[in-house]
Interface confidence: medium
C-alpha cells in the first residue's frame, strides 16, 4: 500500500543501498521513490548534524521485510518511497532553496535578473540538472545575479553548502515545463555513437526509452534487438550523452532502434513505469517469490501489489500449472531490469506496475449545433 | 477547434478520429480511448448512423491526411447509447464503443483515466479540449489534431448564457467569456481534459455549443464524472470485467 | 499509385552547384526513410544519402560527406538534394528511392524514381 | 565500410539455362541482402529482399540463397525478358551494391 506519513526526528538504521546529497526530505523521497530498491529513506538536514559532510545526507534504504528499526535523531526527517502511490508519483521538483548552495559541474554562468528566470534557463538547457543563483545582495558584487547551470553524475549535487544570498534548486523538466521539446521519433535501424552512461536489458525500445527518460544523465539511447547478430548484446539498451546534448555521428545499422530521452517534452512525460505484458518471454533475475496465480494479468498485479517486485514471469509449462494457476515467478535486481531476457519460453513476463501514476491509489487518471 | 494549434504526436494518446465509410470515408466525430476494447464518445455521434459495420475507428493518428486504405483501424463490436439519450434533447450525450479487437497501448496510443464518481469537489484549472474539427462556424474538417486549453465555466454561469436549454448536473462547460476559443463541429465526442495533481482525466465529452466561439456561450459538454456508474455498469456486464482506466 | 518523379538535374560546370527535387506520391511520404542513389554512365549502384523520417536524421557516403546535403519537406511531400562543390566524378543518373520499414520487414529500396542526369563538365 | 563483391561481372546465355550470380559481403551481414534487376536506361526493380524473400508480382523463378557473407541469385530458366543487369545490395550497415553482373544473350 501507499505510506506516505514522514517521521520526525527519528532516521532508519542499516539497509543503506544508496546516499546523497538532497535539499530537503520531499526530495529526498523522490529520490527514494524512482530507485529501483528504496523502499525507505532517511533524511538529514543541515541543523540536525555537525558532521559537515552528512549535512543535507539523504540515505535510501531497503529492507526484505518493508521496515527499518527507527533511532531518534534530533531533526532527521524519515519516510516512505511513494512507490505504490499512483499520482503522487512525480519526478517534478519545483522548490527554490533559498541559502542554499548545490555544487555540481558548473557549465554555464550568465546573468539574470531573477531565480525564476535562471530556473527556466536550466529548464530550457539540455545538460542542466540543477542551478544556483546569486542575488542581488550577494556579498561579492562581481557574482551578484550570477546563473550557474550544473550537472552532476548522478543529477544530485556533489554537495550542498549553507551560503547566505544564494538560492538554488532543479530542473523543470520532469515538470514538462522544457521549452526544448522532445524527438518522438523512434529511428529504426541507426545506432547512435558517443558515451555509454549505463547499459540496462529491456525488451523493446519503448522500455528502453522511458529508462533514458527518467536516468539522471541520459539524453539519448540505442537499443540491440532480439535478432541483433551478437548474441551476447540482444536487448540491451544502452543509455548515451554526449557534450553537445545530440549524437556527434548515427550509423545505419540493422537490427538497432535509437531514439531520444523525452524528458524535455513539453507537457506530457511518459509514465515512469512499464505495462506492456511480452508473450513467450523471460525475465531473469533475483527471486522474490514464487505463486500459484490465474492469468498473466494477476501475475502482474502480484508482482504491483509486492512493493519490491520489479518484474515478473508468469510460466506457462505443464509442470508450473495446477488446473487453472500457473507458477508467477516474482523477481527483482539491482537496476530494476531483467538480468537476462530469453525468447522462445512457455509463458509471459512484464513489470511491476509500481510506478504507474495510475496505480491502486490514483483516481486515473448541432441543436443549438451538436459537435 | 476554434483558437486552437497543432498537436504532435503522443500528446493525446486517447483521442481517436471514429470515420464512417460508406461511398468515400470522412471522420465524424472524436472519442476517448478508455480500455484495450473501449471508447467513449457522444451518443449524437449515431444519429441516423446506428450501423456498426460503416464505422472505422483510428487510434494513434496525428494527421488524418496520412490514413490511407492501408491504415490499420478498429472496428465496432458494440456500440452502447446511453439508454435515457433522445435524438431531441442534449441530455445524456454519452455512448461507449465496443471494439472489435483489444488495441495494444504504445506511446501513441494510450486510454485517459476516469475521474471518481460524481467528482465534484476537485477544482480544475487546466483544461484542454483536442479534435480534428472545423476551425470556425462555416470551416472544414482539419488535418492535423487540434488542442485549446480552455477553463470550466460553473453551471450557474453556463445557464445564464443557454436560457432556452436545461444545463443539467450532468453537464460541464468551458469557454472564454469574450469567446475565441471553442470546439467546433467534428469535435464532438472527443475528450474535454484537464490535468489535476500531474494526472491527465476525461472531464467531459464533447457534445453541443451555440455556433463555435461565440462571445459569451461557451461549449456544453457531457460531464463523465456523472455516469461512472453507467460506464462501470456497461464495461463490466459487457465481458466481466472492467477494461478500461476506472477510479480507485 | 505509388511514384517518385525526379527533377533539378543538368549540366554544370565543376565547382558548381545543382538541387535536385524528388515529389513523392500514392503513400504516406512522412513515415519512410528516403534515399538518394547515382549510376554513373556505363557503371553500377551506388547509394549517395538517406534521411530519416523526420528529416532529424541524415547519413551520406564518404564521397559525397561535406559536400551534399540531404533534406525533406514533409508538408510537400519532396525530397532535395543539394549538390556543391560539384566534380567531374559526380555525373550521373540520380535516383531517388524509399526504403520501407516495419513488419513484414521491406528495408531495401523498393520503390524507385526514373532517374535525372546530372552533367558535371566543363 | 562493408564491400560487395559480384561474380561473375559478366555472363552469357541462352533462354532456358539455369542462371546463379553470387555475391560475397566483406563482413556478416545476417540476411540484409536485397537483388535487383537493372535494364538499360531504366531504374533498378527489386526481386528479392531478406536474402529469400521475393518480392510481390516477381516470377517464381527467381530465388535468393545465402546468409552471412555467401549470397546467390539463381534464374531456374531463363527468359527472353531476364536479360538485364543485377545487383546486390547490403542494408546491414549502410547501404552498399555489388558492381553488377551483366547477363547478355550467348
Known amino acids: 500500500g501507499c505510506l506516505t506519513q514522514l517521521y520526525e526526528n527519528a532516521f532508519f538504521r542499516g539497509g543503506d543501498v544508496a546516499s546523497m546529497y538532497t535539499p530537503n526530505a520531499q526530495y529526498c523521497q523522490m529520490r527514494c521513490t524512482f530507485h529501483p530498491r528504496c523502499l525507505l529513506f532517511s533524511f538529514l538536514p543541515a541543523s540536525s548534524i555537525n558532521d559537515m559532510e552528512k549535512r543535507f545526507g539523504c540515505f535510501l534504504k531497503d529492507s526484505v521485510t518493508g521496515t527499518l528499526p527507527k533511532v531518534h535523531r534530533t531533526g532527521a526527517v524519515s519516510g516512505h518511497s511513494l512507490k505504490q502511490c499512483g499520482h503522487q508519483i512525480s519526478a517534478c521538483h519545483r522548490d527554490i532553496y533559498k541559502g542554499v548552495d548545490m555544487r555540481g559541474v558548473n557549465f554555464n554562468v550568465s546573468k539574470v535578473s531573477s531565480v525564476e528566470e535562471c530556473q527556466k534557463r536550466c529548464t530550457s538547457n539540455i545538460r542542466c540538472q540543477f542551478f544556483s543563483y546569486a542575488t542581488q545582495t550577494f556579498h561579492k558584487a562581481e557574482y551578484r545575479n550570477n546563473c550557474l547551470l550544473k550537472y552532476s553524475p548522478g543529477g544530485t549535487p556533489t554537495a550542498i553548502k549553507v551560503l547566505s544570498n544564494v538560492e538554488s534548486g532543479f530542473s523543470l523538466k520532469p515538470c514538462a515545463l522544457s521549452e526544448i521539446g522532445c524527438h518522438m521519433n523512434i529511428f529504426q535501424h541507426l545506432a547512435f555513437s558517443d558515451v555509454d552512461v549505463a547499459r540496462v536489458l529491456t525488451p523493446d525500445a519503448f522500455v528502453c526509452r522511458t529508462i533514458c527518460t527518467y536516468h539522471p544523465n541520459c539524453l539519448f539511447f540505442t537499443f540491440y534487438t532480439n535478432v541483433w547478430k551478437i548474441e551476447s548484446q540482444r536487448n540491451v539498451c544502452l543509455l548515451k550523452t554526449s557534450e553537445s546534448g545530440t549524437p556527434s555521428s548515427s550509423t545505419p545499422q540493422e537490427n538497432t532502434i535509437s531514439g531520444y530521452s523525452l524528458l524535455t517534452c513539453k507537457r506530457t512525460l511518459p509514465e515512469p513505469c512499464h505495462s506492456k505484458i511480452y508473450p513467450g518471454v523471460d525475465f531473469g533475475g533475483e527471486e522474490l517469490n514464487v505463486t500459484f496465480v490465474k492469468g498473466v494479468n494477476v501475475c502482474q498485479e502480484t508482482c504491483t501489489k509486492m512493493i519490491r517486485c520489479q518484474f515478473f514471469t508468469y510460466s506457462l509449462l505443464p509442470e508450473d500449472c495446477k488446473e487453472e494457476k500457473c507458477k508467477c515467478f516474482l523477481r527483482l535486481s539491482m537496476d530494476g531490469s531483467p538480468t537476462r531476457i530469453a525468447y522462445g519460453t512457455q509463458g509471459s513476463s512484464g513489470y511491476s506496475l509500481r510506478l504507474c501514476n495510475t496505480g491502486d491509489n490514483s483516481v486515473c487518471t448541432t441543436k443549438t449545433s451538436t459537435r | 477547434i476554434v483558437g486552437g494549434t497543432n498537436s504532435s504526436w503522443g500528446e493525446w494518446p486517447w483521442q481517436v478520429s471514429l470515420q464512417v465509410k460508406l461511398t468515400a470515408q470522412r471522420h465524424l466525430c472524436g472519442g476517448s480511448l478508455i480500455g484495450h476494447q473501449w471508447v467513449l464518445t457522444a451518443a449524437h455521434c449515431f444519429d441516423g448512423l446506428p450501423l456498426q459495420d460503416v464505422w472505422r475507428i483510428y487510434s494513434g493518428i496525428l494527421n488524418l491526411s496520412d490514413i490511407t486504405k492501408d491504415t490499420p483501424f478498429s472496428q465496432i463490436k458494440e456500440i452502447i447509447i446511453h439508454q435515457n439519450y433522445k435524438v431531441s434533447e442534449g441530455n445524456h450525450d454519452i455512448a461507449l464503443i465496443k471494439l472489435q479487437a483489444p488495441l495494444n497501448y504504445t506511446e501513441f496510443q494510450k486510454p485517459i483515466c476516469l475521474p471518481s464518481k460524481g467528482d465534484t469537489s476537485t477544482i480544475y484549472t487546466n483544461c484542454w479540449v483536442t479534435g480534428w474539427g472545423f476551425s470556425k462556424e462555416k470551416g472544414e474538417i482539419q488535418n492535423i489534431l487540434q488542442k485549446v486549453n480552455i477553463p470550466l465555466v460553473t453551471n450557474e454561469e453556463c445557464q445564464k448564457r443557454y436560457q432556452d436549454y436545461k444545463i443539467t448536473q450532468r453537464m460541464v462547460c468551458a469557454g472564454y467569456k469574450e469567446g475565441g476559443k471553442d470546439a467546433c463541429k467534428g469535435d464532438s465526442g472527443g475528450p474535454l481534459v484537464c490535468k489535476h495533481n500531474g494526472m491527465w482525466r476525461l472531464v467531459g465529452i464533447t457534445s453541443w455549443g451555440e455556433g463555435c466561439a461565440r462571445r459569451e456561450q461557451p461549449g456544453v459538454y457531457t460531464k463523465v464524472a456523472e455516469y461512472m456508474d453507467w460506464i462501470l455498469e456497461k464495461t463490466q456486464s459487457s465481458d466481466g470485467k472492467a477494461q478500461m482506466q476506472s477510479p480507485a | 499509385e505509388v511514384q517518385l518523379l525526379e527533377s533539378g538535374g543538368g549540366l554544370v560546370q565543376p565547382g558548381g552547384s545543382l538541387r535536385l527535387s524528388c515529389a513523392a506520391s500514392g503513400f504516406t511520404f512522412s513515415h519512410y526513410i528516403m534515399m538518394w542513389v547515382r549510376q554513373a554512365p556505363g557503371k553500377g549502384l551506388e547509394w549517395v544519402s538517406g534521411i530519416y523520417s523526420s528529416g532529424g536524421i541524415t547519413v551520406y557516403a564518404d564521397s559525397v560527406k561535406g559536400r551534399f546535403t540531404i533534406s525533406r519537406d514533409n508538408s510537400k511531400n519532396t525530397l532535395y538534394l543539394q549538390m556543391n562543390s560539384l566534380r567531374a566524378e559526380d555525373t550521373a543518373v540520380y535516383y531517388c528511392a524509399y526504403r520501407r520499414t516495419g513488419v513484414p520487414r521491406r528495408d531495401s529500396f523498393d520503390i524507385w524514381g526514373q532517374g535525372t542526369m546530372v552533367t558535371v563538365s566543363s | 565500410d562493408i564491400q560487395m563483391t559480384q561474380s561473375p561481372s559478366t555472363l552469357s546465355a541462352s533462354v532456358g539455362d539455369r542462371v546463379t550470380i553470387t555475391c560475397r559481403a566483406s563482413?556478416?551481414?545476417?540476411?540484409?541482402l536485397a537483388w535487383y534487376q537493372q535494364k538499360p536506361g531504366k531504374a533498378p526493380n527489386l526481386l528479392i529482399y531478406k536474402a529469400s524473400t521475393l518480392e510481390s508480382g516477381v516470377p517464381s523463378r527467381f530465388s535468393g540463397s545465402g546468409s552471412g557473407t555467401e549470397f546467390t541469385l539463381t534464374i531456374s530458366s531463363l527468359q527472353p525478358d531476364d536479360f538485364a543487369t543485377y545487383y546486390c545490395?547490403?542494408?546491414?550497415?549502410?547501404?552498399?551494391f555489388g558492381q553488377g553482373t551483366k547477363v547478355e544473350i550467348k
Open positions: 563482413q556478416s551481414i545476417s540476411s540484409w
Open positions: 545490395q547490403q542494408y546491414n550497415t549502410y547501404w552498399t
